[in-house]
């Protein structure tokens, strides 16, 4: 530990990583050596940075000063930080940004200036010397109102650019066009007024575009003022966006301009509508282009129970391969929609309200003909037998996740789609496993249940996940002749022997930590002498603790030594 000049303490490790966040520092500590590589002073009370404060820290690679109250940084404060790669000045009181701060930072890869009360990004191009910059975050929620053409000059490639333009009033055309390539652009905008102007400048340079916190209720698409159809955008995310039936139709028109769009995502959005997506101008049906993946999470639809016929969406879905609709209060997927999803290979309906009887309507005859993976985790399924029977229509289904549904009981026999290879029944409160489990399985996850016995013959099973149950022994290897992976941690297993392990002829990975091991002399000698064991036991030695004898309880099996007298009683 090194004491700073103003009596608050910093802790530095031998690698030069210094942490001093959430203290009462009111200036940058002066008593540190020049070996310091990382300095985290976030959430303190530093208001002023002088030219000399950081002068000696020539090896500094990361400087985090977020949430301090900094209102002044002297011109040459960062002049000695030629090795600095990470600078976080977010959520301070910097109302004027100076290019002289950043000029010396030739190694800078990450710069965060979010949440400071500046109106613009300064008088001159701030970032033109930062040739190695890869992640840039700028803007604020209220005072940042103007984006200028020179703001991003000199930046050619960014992995991530986040702009909080929540209250943007003015956008100078081509301001964002100067950056040739941005992997991921996050744009916060409350209003959509300038959206199309900005969008025009992004189509040929941004790969993933994320729009946040925007009210699109009154959005209307008008033809883009660009001849370019050569769009680089592959993924478009709407996060915390408000939308209506009509404006969703307008958004779809906008998206149809993006020729290479593959993925659409809606997170935490609100749809104020009843599912009438026709569009008031009776436009042609929108071509969904190449979109293959649609992800919807936590969609809020106030008028969900007044939803109309979704048939206007059906033609848009035929080429989609992957759909996720998670935590959005879905209780029924219309049969007709399921039938239109001809190319769908992956469907995730986690954390919804599906019951078997309504799932039957969704998985009707000819529904989801290409479906291979179905995830129904944490829905309202209650009968394993009914669930399997309901899904018999899905001829190509190989992977099924029905974890976190409450089944309790497993019938003696069940019917399943015949190609089933993967079944997840974890956290379903089942007490026993029966012949209901399909023999075709290669992977079975039944972790976190109430099982005290596993005696199923699964001739093709390669991976068994059975942690967090009440098993007292390893399963019988002869019942699982192809097993490669066995994860059986956090059960009540007291011991296992070399003979038991050897009987799993194909086993490559065993995870058996967190059990109640009786550290007998036999168990200790077997585990401590087998060097090869460490290769198989992936969680060895940390998770293997003795439960008894009492005097070694809590100690690692690897470390315990019993006396000669204890072993020769």
């Amino acid at each position: 530990k090194e004491e700073s000049s103003n009596q608050a303490s910093l802790s530095c490790d031998h690698n030069g990583i210094c942490k001093g966040s959430s203290g009462s520092l009111n200036s940058i500590p002066s008593g540190l050596t020049e070996a310091v590589k990382s300095l985290d002073l976030s959430n303190n009370r530093i208001t002023y940075i002088s030219n000399s404060d950081l002068q000696r820290y020539v090896n500094l690679q990361a400087l985090v000063l977020t949430s301090n109250g900094i209102n002044t940084i002297e011109e040459d404060s960062f002049s000695s930080l030629g090795r600095l790669e990470h600078l976080d000045l977010s959520y301070n009181y910097l109302s004027n940004l100076s290019s002289s701060w950043f000029k010396p930072l030739s190694s800078l890869k990450f710069l965060n200036l979010l949440g400071n009360p500046y109106k613009t990004l300064g008088e001159t191009s701030l970032f033109s010397h930062l040739t190695k910059l890869r992640i840039l975050r700028v803007g604020n929620m209220d005072t940042f109102t103007k984006i200028q053409r020179k703001d991003f000059a000199g930046l050619t490639f960014l992995e991530e650019l986040e702009i909080d333009a929540s209250d943007l009033q003015s956008y100078e055309p081509k301001s964002l066009k100067s950056i040739q390539n941005v992997s991921h652009l996050i744009l916060h905008m409350k209003q959509h007024i300038l959206l199309l102007e900005i969008f025009v400048d992004l189509t040929s340079s941004v790969e993933c575009l994320e729009l946040r916190d925007t009210d699109l209720d009154t959005f209307h698409f008008s033809e883009l003022s660009t001849g370019e159809t050569n769009s680089l955008i592959k993924k478009f995310t709407f996060r915390n966006v408000k939308i209506t039936d009509e404006s969703l139709f307008q958004v779809m028109k906008l998206l149809s301009q993006i020729s290479g769009l593959l993925e659409l995502e809606f997170d935490d959005c609100t749809l104020n509508g009843v599912g009438d997506f026709r569009g008031s101008d009776n436009d042609r049906v929108i071509d969904p282009g190449k979109v293959e993946t649609v992800t919807i999470r936590r969609l809020h639809i106030p008028q969900f129970y007044s939803f109309n016929d979704l048939s206007t969406l059906y033609p848009l879905t035929e080429r989609v391969k992957r759909i996720t609709v998670e935590n959005s209060k879905v209780f029924l997927v219309p049969c007709l929609l399921s039938r239109h999803l001809k190319s769908l290979e992956y469907l995730d309906l986690s954390e919804n309200l599906m019951v078997e009887e309504y799932l039957k309507n969704s998985a009707c005859e000819d529904a989801w003909p290409s479906l291979q993976t179905l995830i129904l985790r944490q829905n309202h399924l209650a009968s394993l037998g009914k669930t399997g029977e309901t899904l018999l229509t899905l001829k190509n289904l190989t992977n099924l996740d029905i974890s976190k549904n409450t089944f309790h009981y497993m019938p003696e026999t069940c019917q399943w789609p015949e190609k089933m290879k993967y079944l997840n029944l974890s956290s379903t409160r089942i007490h026993s496993v029966t012949g209901c489990i399909p023999k075709t399985l290669e992977i079975l996850d039944i972790s976190n249940n109430n099982l005290n016995l596993f005696s199923l013959n699964l001739p093709q099973l390669k991976e068994l996940y059975i942690s967090r149950n009440k098993l007292m022994t390893l399963p019988d290897a002869s019942l699982l002749p192809m097993l490669l992976v066995l994860k059986i941690s956090r059960n009540t297993i007291t011991t296992f022997s070399k003979e038991q392990l050897d009987s799993f002829h194909t086993l490559k990975t065993l995870e058996a930590g967190g059990n109640n091991f009786i550290c007998s002399c036999e168990f200790l000698s077997f585990t401590q002498e087998q060097q090869a064991l460490a290769k198989v036991l992936v969680d060895w030695p940390a998770n293997y603790l003795c439960d008894s004898p009492s005097h070694v309880r809590g100690q690692r099996v690897q470390d315990v030594r019993l006396s000669v007298s204890e072993c020769h009683r």
Epitope: Y305, S306, K329, C335, L353, E357, N361, H380
Partner: antibody, heavy 118, light 111 residues
């Protein structure tokens, strides 16, 4: 097994407020909606509204929008309904019920009798 | 609001015979091929108990003598053969549109 245990009978003065509770057990509280239903003396059933414990979202019958407030405490798996500005019209048995499949009420509490009288 | 009209308000039946209770909705309660209509039984001093959901799906643990049918606006609950334990109140309920509404109830009586 699934259970919804409601708080005991209440006798309150007109104009006052009352908070009824519904403690859930035997299922994952945050996975299901909790509905509230009113049954006046010798009368039919009237849907008040629901709350989803996972995100706290609510939906109300317009007739009860200014009368009832729904909340949950996920740490104790308990749902609450507070009724305001009580009148004799509010005297009734109030049931909480678990909403399954987004559409049906498969488990009900035993009911709380509310009597509003001076 | 969708109004549910149950008929008759009371029905006298002989034990062992069939009882049919009707419920008519003021507009369709169809939702993409599923009728969002439920039936509940209520005994005196007890909460309602779910019998049928989605118009025809019998809730787990409910005796097979109970069945539901219908679509669109017209639904019925059938009990056959009627047992003494069934001589109580029955309510229909729709969850197609908010606010969810219940029928006025039908009281089963012994003839």
């Amino acid at each position: 097994q699934v259970q919804l245990q409601q708080s005991g009978p209440e006798l309150v003065n007109p104009g006052a407020s009352v908070k009824l509770s519904c403690k859930a057990s035997g299922f994952t509280f945050t996975t299901y909606g909790i509905n509230w239903v009113k049954q006046g003396p010798g009368q039919g059933l009237e849907w008040i509204g629901w709350i989803y414990p996972r995100d706290g979202s609510t939906n109300f019958n317009e007739n009860f929008k200014d009368k009832a407030a729904l909340t949950v405490d996920t740490s104790s798996s308990t749902a609450y309904m507070e009724l305001h500005s009580l009148t004799s019209e509010d005297s009734a048995v109030y049931f909480c019920a678990r909403l399954t499949g987004g559409t049906f009420l498969d488990y009900w509490g035993q009911g709380t009798t509310l009597t509003v009288s001076s | 609001d969708i109004v549910l009209t149950q008929s008759p308000a009371s029905l006298a039946v002989s034990l062992g015979q069939r009882a049919t209770i009707s419920c008519r909705a003021s507009e369709s309660v169809e939702y993409y091929g599923t009728s969002l209509m439920q039936w509940y039984q209520q005994k005196p001093g007890q909460p309602p108990k779910l019998l049928i959901f989605g118009a025809s799906n019998v809730e787990s643990g409910v005796p097979v003598r109970f069945s539901g049918s219908g679509s669109g606006t017209d639904f019925s609950l059938n009990i056959h053969p009627v047992e003494e334990d069934d001589i109580v109140m029955y309510f229909c309920q729709q969850s197609r549109k908010l606010p969810w509404t219940f029928g006025g109830g039908t009281k089963l009586e012994i003839k």
